[in-house]
């Protein structure tokens, strides 16, 4: 069971300092951006991290949303990352959800975060290069020190 708590506005970067944004096709991508680029591209660079209380504490449960024309929420349905046009619900009556990720700091590095799927144990949000694009994907990972599954989260509130 997940119950919605507060939310915060954040900029999410990979460890190469590329900024996560949602493109015109609703795809989550990473790109090099200056601070002014980041501001100019808002709200596509500003993510709403919705925190949830978890009935079985497993780390900080979050849903990640973005508000452009409408609110879209990150989902890993069928292990595929996409933004679905939906508001994060107030309550989720299950221990797993395609929109809930566990945000945890990398041990010994409080500023580096990993996001593990609540639906798929051992699967993490990751940045992966595909042709010329740096995409946000869901990846099964047993190398937890791999930088591709680490991110920084900068609060904008």
């Amino acid at each position: 069971y997940f119950g919605k708590l507060e939310s915060k506005l954040s900029i999410i970067r990979n460890l190469n300092d590329q900024v996560l944004f949602i493109d015109q096709g609703n795809r989550p991508l990473f790109e090099d951006m200056t601070d002014s680029d980041c501001r100019d591209n808002a709200p596509r660079t500003i993510f709403i991290i919705n925190m949830y209380k978890d009935s079985q504490p497993r780390g900080m449960a979050v849903a990640i949303s973005v508000k452009c024309e409408k609110i879209s929420t990150l989902s890993c349905e069928n292990r595929i990352i996409s933004f679905k046009e939906m508001n994060p619900p107030d309550n989720i009556k299950d221990t797993k959800s395609d929109i809930i990720f566990f945000q945890r700091s990398v041990p010994g590095h409080d500023n580096k975060m990993q996001f593990e799927s609540s639906s798929y144990e051992g699967y993490f949000l990751a940045c992966e290069k595909e042709r010329d694009l740096y995409k946000l994907i869901l990846k099964k990972k047993d190398e937890l020190g791999d930088r591709s599954i680490m991110f920084t989260v900068q609060n904008e509130d």
Epitope: R104, P107, G108, D142, L144, G145
Partner: antibody
Amino acid sequence: QVQLVQSGAEVKKPGASVKVSCKVSGEISTGYYFHWVRQAPGKGLEWMGRIDPEDDSTKYAERFKDRVTMTEDTSTDTAYMELSSLRSEDTAVYYCTTWRIYRDSSGRPFYVMDAWGQGTLVTVSS
Amino acid sequence: DIQMTQSPSSVSASVGDRVTITCLASEDIYTYLTWYQQKPGKAPKLLIYGANKLQDGVPSRFSGSGSGTDFTLTISSLQPEDFATYYCLQGSKFPLTFGQGTKLEIK
């Protein structure tokens, strides 16, 4: 309690291949991997590689990648490690081990080699 | 590849002694480090994971510490059954690498 039972000792000639099996008995959750580790007589532990039973993807140590093949038969819960072009330096005890997530109090994951087979001695001698 | 340098390679000690073994990683491995105990003719046994978390059933005289590149295994008061070889293993990135081992012998 998970137990790993390996096949028996083997004696092989240089240039031959050996295939070691590792059968899981007991209840094991999903989301584990099989790793293979070897130990030459009187020496330390050496990681050889791993296989993911979910999709059969493998990762091999560079020094073995041209000679080793790791496979898994989900229907019998058995993993296999085949090493080809054997030489005398491959004389060692070969262990299979499971690689599973353990968690701390905040749910943070750590992969751990927890269950180990009893080891299989492979002797390479002409 | 990440190199794991374990020291000392051997140590002689008596029952009741406090013993410390160190492992040094060639790059940051966070706390993705495990410690194993191995006795002759037997498979390794997990003692500590996540650098400092005691595996269930392992006596509390064993403790681990460290983060980043420097790690320590401490046995606070040696018991006769502790004489064995100890290995560290980094699980941060492939290829996984073990330390060279520390043989703990009776003085």
